[in-house]
């Protein structure tokens, strides 16, 4: 039950996170005009990954796309790439995790297969979240650098008496959405990985081996322990056979998730 809850919660958290990453990537307010300590302008400038916008005091908003690819800063291209990779990985992760959910039965899918899929989706969510956090952080770092550079040159002389005011940009809403969404996706991924450990059967599936013990014959059946929700001792588990014969298989240590292919 706890495994199903953990897996389900991980899926939901990741779903919200990936939706947030998509929203952040599409948002126009990655950087917004800094209004503090600036001349009061009758326009408000803000920029996204794909276009820049200007809202005039009348409420009229005009946006222009970045129609060039080669002319854009390498950092912006890198941020775009990170966000897209994050979305793609997250989307694939969501697809995989749907089939991995314990509450959904698909044919005669083994628990081990579900465990593998849960682990795979969990790793994808973690990488997706990290991509989003990295992308947003790179953009934020770019903003901070440019902010202080433009503060240093706040008023640059133009032909003696004429001055030009440099527009400074600060963090936009999309950055906070991206950080939170990336964090949620990361947490969701970790939860999926934790759920994977509980989903994994407690023993490797060896072929049934028949052997004879002195006195009477016993067939050793695989799955001597029923799958438990975690690792470590489980006093509730009962052996499903009784016999004096023992094999090396019986006394082996509990399998780890790496035992499953």
């Amino acid at each position: 039950m706890a495994v199903t809850a953990c897996q389900g919660l991980g899926f939901v958290v990741s779903l919200i996170g990936i939706a947030g990453i998509i929203a952040a990537t599409c948002m126009d307010q990655w950087s917004t005009q800094d209004l503090y300590n600036n001349p009061v302008t009758a326009v408000f400038n803000y920029q996204g990954l794909w276009r820049s916008c200007v809202r005039e005091s009348s409420g009229f908003t005009e946006c222009r796309g970045y129609f060039t690819l080669l002319g854009l800063p390498a950092m912006l291209q890198a941020v775009r790439a990170l966000m897209i990779v994050g979305i793609v990985l997250g989307a694939i992760g969501l697809l995989v995790s749907i089939f991995a959910l314990k509450c959904i039965r698909i044919g005669s899918m083994e628990d081990s297969a579900k465990a593998n899929m849960t682990l795979t989706s969990g790793i994808m969510f973690i990488v997706s979240g990290l991509c989003a956090i990295a992308g947003v952080s790179v953009f934020a770092n770019m903003l901070v650098t440019n902010f202080w550079m433009s503060t240093a040159n706040m008023y640059t002389g133009m032909g003696g008496m004429v001055q030009t005011v440099q527009t400074r940009y600060t963090f936009g809403a999309a950055l906070f959405v991206g950080w939170v969404a990336g964090g949620l996706t990361l947490i969701g991924g970790v939860m999926m990985c934790i759920a994977c450990r509980g989903l994994a059967p407690e023993e490797t599936n060896y072929k049934a081996v028949s052997y004879h013990a002195s006195g009477h014959s016993v067939a050793y059946k695989p799955g001597g322990f029923k799958a438990s929700t975690g690792f470590g001792s489980n006093t509730k588990n009962k052996k499903i056979y009784d016999g004096g014969a023992r094999t090396e298989d019986e006394v082996q240590s509990y399998p780890s998730k790496h035992d499953y292919v």
Partner: antibody
Framework: EVQLVESGGGLVQPGGSLRLSCAAS????????MHWVRQAPGKGLEWVSY????????YYVDKLKGRFTISRDNAKNSLYLQMNSLRAEDTAVYYC?????????????WGQGTLVTVSS | DIVMTQSPDSLAVSLGERATINCKSS????????????LAWYQQKPGQPPKLLIY???TRESGVPDRFIGSGSGTDFTLTISSLQAEDVAVYFC?????????FGGGTKVEIK
């Protein structure tokens, strides 16, 4: 047809108060920012104040802050300018003007103006 | 505050001739966000309110004759009346539309020679 009609001007003594009104018609008043601009006799234009469609933000020319108050009533399609502690230099024709949409913040329609004379 | 300086103060031009009015701002009126200039030109005839002619430094307001041409960028702007007509006798004002307080130039009086 867009129409802006100012009223409330007249002769007032220095230190007195006056409230100007601007009645708007022919457009959706609640969707537009509005300005007050004044022009002293024989002089140039001087921007006074701006109020956005939702009454915030509001801007004033620095020298009139504290004495003049701009407000609007979207239900009545009206713009107001409350002028207190009036001085002789406030004598001018006061125009209300609409902040045009998609015209780079320009003032696209103006009223005929109302004359305010501050004199003892 | 942005200071708008218009020149000349007055201008006498023959009918059909070109009239040129200059306007200089103390700070650039080019908004980097959209690469647009926030400068407007107004025409005021005696006893009338101002009328918007040009916005965004070069875009004519609807209904304005094409003999009125706005040009310039940054801090230097020009209003040109390519062929002066009798009805163009008026005072012309430029206005900063980028920074509050919005400021006007002192005006240029255009007359017929």
């Amino acid at each position: 047809e867009v129409q802006l009609v100012e009223s409330g001007g007249g002769l007032v003594q220095p230190g007195g108060s006056l409230r100007l009104s601007c009645a708007a018609s022919g457009f959706t008043f609640s969707s537009f920012g509005m300005h007050w601009v004044r022009q002293a006799p024989g002089k140039g234009l001087e921007w006074v104040s701006y109020i956005s469609s939702g009454s915030s933000p509001i801007y004033y020319v620095d020298k009139l802050k504290g004495r003049f108050t701009i407000s609007r009533d979207n239900a009545k399609n009206s713009l107001y300018l409350q002028m207190n502690s009036l001085r002789a230099e406030d004598t001018a024709v006061y125009y209300c003007a609409r902040a045009g949409y998609a015209v780079r913040n320009a003032l696209d329609y103006w009223g005929q103006g109302t004359l305010v004379t501050v004199s003892s | 505050d942005i200071v708008m300086t218009q020149s000349p103060d007055s201008l006498a031009v023959s009918l059909g001739e070109r009239a040129t009015i200059n306007c200089k701002s103390s700070q650039s009126l080019l908004n980097v966000g959209n690469q647009k200039n926030y400068l407007a030109w107004y025409q005021q005839k005696p006893g009338q309110p101002p009328k918007l002619l040009i916005y965004g430094a070069s875009t004519r307001e609807s209904g304005v004759p094409d003999r009125f041409i706005g040009s310039g960028s940054g801090t230097d702007f020009t209003l040109t009346i390519s062929s002066l007509q009798a009805e163009d006798v008026a005072v012309y004002f430029c206005q900063n539309d980028l920074f509050y307080p919005l400021t006007f130039g002192g005006g240029t009086k255009v007359e017929i020679k």
